[in-house]
Every structure is written in C-alpha cells, then in structure tokens.
C-alpha cells in the first residue's frame, strides 16, 4: 500500500481467482481510544470498532472510503484504490492502445519547436468517474523539473457504436535549453483513476524525436509570364524556434491533381519558394520538417492552382 | 579553419559537410519502425558519448560571444564518433554491406574534424570507452545506438555551422 495523495492510498493486488489479497491496517487519527466505529463509503453498517481496523483487500468491493467516527462525528478517512497486476503485468483497462508508432502506445506526445513545451494526449472510452494527474521530469535518477498543467478533455469522437474521448495536457520544461543536444529523455507519468481503479502510464522521449512543426504559413502562388509555371512561396510557421538561420526547416512541395490516382509531383527544397507546373484543377501543398533531424513532417498547407 | 588560438572556421564548407553528415547518418540508420533503443539499457554506450550541452556555447548567443568553446566541443565529438565508426563495433561481424553509408560517414566525420583543426594544432580529445561486444547481435545493437546518438550530435553541429555561415562568415 502506498499514498497517492492526501488521504488516498493505492493497494497493489495480484489479480487472479482466489488470490489472498492484501491485509491493510487502518488507524484512526485521534487521541481517543474508546467508542470509535468504522464504516465504508455511504453505508451506515459498522465494519469494526476500535482505533484500528484490519481488512483483507481482495476485490473492488473492499476498496472505497473508510471513515472512523465517534459519537456521530467524523474523525478521519482514507480512500483505498486498487491497482491490479495480472500475470505480472499492471492493468491498462482505462486507456486505449493507440498502436502508433508501436503497440502498447497509450500516451502520444508532440512538440511544435525546441522550446521545451510539449503536448501529450491519450484516448479512453470511459466518460464518467475519471480523473487524471500528470507528472513529468527530465531524467529519472536526478530529475530536472518539467511543469504540466491539468489534463483536459480535448475531443470527443464517435467510433462505430462507441464514443471515444481524447484528453490532453501541456507541459513545459522549467529550464529548457533549445540549442543543446538532449542526453536525458523526458519522462511523462500519468496517474489514471476510474471509480476505485488506479492505473499508471508512462512515456519516455527526447523532444527532438517528437518534433512536428506547424504547417508553413502564407502560402502564395505567383504565375510566371507566358508559362504554365508558378512560383510558390511560403513562410516559416510562427511557432517554430528562432533564429531560423539556426533552427532551419526543409520543405516538400507537392502538386496533386483532383483525383488521388493522379501522379503527384514532389519537390524538396531548403528555400521558402519553388517553381512548379500548375495543372488545371490541381492543388499545391507544402509541408515542413526539421532540416537536420528526421522527426515528423508537418501537416500540409494547401492552395488551389486556379 | 578553426585554429585553437581563435580564428574563424570555413563556415560555409563546414555547413555543407555537416549537412551531408546529417543525411549520411540518417541513411546509415533510418528510423526503422520506430525502434526504441533506449529500452535496451544503454548506460554503457551513450553515457560516455560527448554531448553538446547547455553550457558549451553552441547556442546563437554563445556563438556570437565566442564560437571557440562550441567548435572545440564539436571537434571532440567528431573525433570520438570517427574512432567509434572505425572500431571493431563497425568493422567486426556482422559485416556491413559494401554500399553501406557508414564508410562515407566515417570519412566525412574525419573530413569535418580536419576542417576544424588543421594539422599541427591540438585540442584535447575525449577517451573512447572500451566497448568490445562479443556477440554479433550485441554489436548490431551497439551500432544502432551509436548511429542514433550520432544523428542527434550532427544535427546540433549542422545548426551551428548553418548559423555561423549565415551570420558569422567574414
């Protein structure tokens, strides 16, 4: 048993049929010795009397808020949550496996630049009685500070018969050093509680590996005289790290016909302009990637050829 | 060329060669299905690698103030990786394919280190840890880890030289 937060405790249980469970001793926080009774949750049934209560925690029916009373007055309480371990593996019932970029990916994180700010998100089909708490640090043995906000519901989607809920959190490294080469990964830990079930999820990454720039901005076309060619120009996204002479991007320019089956023409360039042939009904798209490190490409910014 | 006394390197040449290094490092070890090598306990490998850290003066302001600290750090790293790529880890079994970019990568690391430090000038270099994996699979894993680490190192070096070429060239 360990303390999750003030007055909330997690009991770790091996979860198999007829498992013996864990013996937990609760002590009432009072100098009184006599007339103390114990109850669980909203029930008025007295579970025991005396300054301590010994319980065998085996299943969710044994978890909940234990309260000690004297003469109708509440003296103290402790909320017990369960963390299930099945076949040596902690349960992952609350969050959905996103399977990207690999199986057992429950948390996904992205950064728009090297400032030390990043966003993580996760998915669940659970809609109520659900709380999340997020902690983060750089490194684990001698951790350096990362501050995370509160996790919030950021999207709801219908997937077949099920509703899927996306939660996200923003974190910021306290003393970020954008120009340095990271040697210790960022660790993100999410505590998830659904009713009386506790689970924890972790992710470990370097900011450089989760970089995904915003799409290029101010994408414009300028027709060239007496030619089917156009000059495409764009700018670095506002959210990208500066100066751009140091934090440089590379770009991919694509000419795409109306039909997905049509051949795509692609040009790669480090400049913020390119000359391409604009076909009728086609569109021109540009996306960005860190010039020196192959992290994710941005989403496309697009304009129609006409 | 960067002389330890303090004259400027050939920023543009360094920029071109460092960008080529980035390309070679990624072609030597593309992101294979997001193989997370940090799960494989890499203390003995990458902890001893010279990282470009916050106080090394490789940020834009540090380069403007005095680029020598940063260039020395980059030089140290280039020599370190050049020795690793020439070691038994990469020359032993399993043999690299004849057209592997590792050979080119090795030569380019040496080329850039020489651009930074001409013959006869000596910056302090870092000791190479004695990594001699006995099993071919261990060697393969070590190669991947070293190349992943090198990708991060050359990315920072390339940013330094790109910025230098754009803002510090005479």
């Amino acid at each position: 048993i360990w303390e999750l937060k003030k007055d909330v405790y997690v009991v770790e249980l091996d979860w198999y049929p007829d498992a013996p469970g864990e013996m937990v001793v609760l002590t009432c926080d009072t100098p009184e010795e006599d007339g103390i009774t114990w109850t669980l949750d909203q029930s008025s049934e007295v579970l025991g009397s005396g300054k301590t209560l010994t319980i065998q925690v085996k299943e969710f029916g044994d978890a909940g808020q234990y309260t000690c009373h004297k003469g109708g007055e509440v003296l103290s309480h402790s909320l017990l949550l369960l963390h299930k371990k099945e076949d040596g593996i902690w349960s992952t019932d609350i969050l959905k496996d996103q399977k990207e970029p690999k199986n057992k990916t429950f948390l996904r994180c992205e950064a728009k630049n090297y400032s030390g700010r990043f966003t993580c998100w996760w998915l669940t089909t659970i809609s109520t009685d659900l709380t999340f708490s997020v902690k983060s640090s750089r490194g684990s043995s001698d951790p350096q500070g990362v501050t995370c906000g509160a996790a919030t519901l950021s999207a709801e989607r219908v997937r077949g018969d099920n509703k899927e809920y996306e939660y996200s959190v923003e974190c910021q490294e306290d003393s970020a050093c954008p120009a340095a080469e990271e040697s210790l990964p960022i660790e993100v830990m999410v505590d998830a509680v659904h009713k009386l079930k506790y689970e924890n999820y972790t992710s470990s990454f370097f900011i450089r590996d989760i970089i995904k720039p915003d799409p290029p901005k101010n994408l414009q076309l300028k027709p060239l005289k007496n030619s089917r060619q156009v000059e495409v120009s764009w700018e670095y996204p506002d959210t990208w790290s500066t100066p751009h002479s140091y934090f440089s991007l590379t770009f991919c320019v694509q000419v795409q016909g109306k039909s997905k089956r049509e051949k795509k023409d692609r040009v790669f360039t480090d400049k913020t302009s390119a000359t391409v042939i604009c076909r009728k009904n086609a569109s021109i798209s540009v996306r960005a990637q860190d010039r020196y490190y192959s992290s994710s490409w941005s989403e496309w910014a697009s304009v129609p050829c006409s | 060329r960067a002389v330890p006394g303090g004259s400027s390197p050939a920023w543009t040449q360094c920029q071109q060669l460092s960008q080529k290094l980035c390309t070679l490092a990624w072609s030597a070890h593309p992101l294979v299905g997001h193989m997370d090598l940090r799960e494989e306990g890499d203390e003995e490998t990458t902890n001893d690698v010279p990282h470009i850290q916050c106080g090394d003066g490789c940020d834009p302001q540090g380069l403007r103030d005095n680029s020598q600290f940063c260039l020395q750090r980059i030089h140290q790293g280039l020599i370190f990786y050049e020795k690793l790529l020439g070691s038994d880890i990469f020359t032993g079994e399993p043999s690299l394919l004849p057209d592997s970019p590792v050979g080119q990568l090795h030569a380019s690391l040496l080329g850039l280190s020489q651009l930074l430090q001409p013959e006869g000038h000596h910056w302090e270099t870092q000791q190479i840890p004695s990594l001699s994996p006995s099993q071919p699979w261990q060697r393969l894993l070590l190669r991947f880890k070293i190349l992943r680490s090198l990708q991060a190192f050359v990315a920072v070096a390339a940013r330094v030289f790109a910025h230098g070429a754009a803002t510090l060239s005479p």
Epitope: E3, K6, D7, V8, T27, C28, D29, T30, P31, K51, L75, S76, H77, S78 | -
Partner: nanobody, 126 residues
Framework: EVQLVESGGGLVQAGGSLRLSCAAS????????AGWFRQDPGEEREFVST????????GYADAVKGRFTISRDNAKNTVYLQMNNLKPEDTAVYYC???????????????????WGQGTQVTVSS
Amino acid sequence: EVQLVESGGGLVQAGGSLRLSCAASGRTFSTYAAGWFRQDPGEEREFVSTISRGGGTTGYADAVKGRFTISRDNAKNTVYLQMNNLKPEDTAVYYCAAADVSYGTTTDDPKRYDYWGQGTQVTVSS
C-alpha cells in the same frame, strides 16, 4: 492560506515550565499536521515535535522526549507545546508550522511544512 501566531514564550528558570500556543486562522487547521521547530541565531532550524491532523499521532526529538508534550484542539484551531523541566540548552526561538499531509501522518522534515509562524522567544536561565 493559513496564518500562524505563536504565544507563551518568555524567560524561565532551569527546571521550570512553559506552555506555548499556536493559534491558526484562515483555512481549516484540522486539515494540516502541525509541528514545533526551534532555532538559535546562526543555526539551522531544529525539529522539536509534531502532531497529526486528528491528534492521534505525535513525534518528538530525542532531546525533548519525556519533557515536552504536544497536543491540539481543532475546535479552537490551536496547537500546544507543554514544556516541563526546561534546560538552558532549550533556549531558542520556537516556531509553529503547518504541513498539508494525510490523516495520521506526521513529519519532522521542515521542507514538508507549508506555513510558518513568526516565532516566540524562549529563554532558560541557569
């Protein structure tokens, strides 16, 4: 926020007694463990005694065990430190502090305490 005000300090002969009080205002004091610490000029703050939110758990520094008793009255939002058989080495400024911890929890670590009083001087003459 919790404001803490100590009182009851003063000058006393060796072997004498004093009772320090710590009155809390602001948020409900019963949601905080409380502690007494003392400090000599130029020295580190030293743990004296601690009591849990409900008063069921107490702790003492070895130097004061058997001589000092900590108690609390949550109805009055007050914590007390009864000091008997005082010695000249007990001379110090005594501080009351509040820690945001679970029921039944006490701590002697000053870093765990969120709120501190201004202190009250205790002088024991020989």
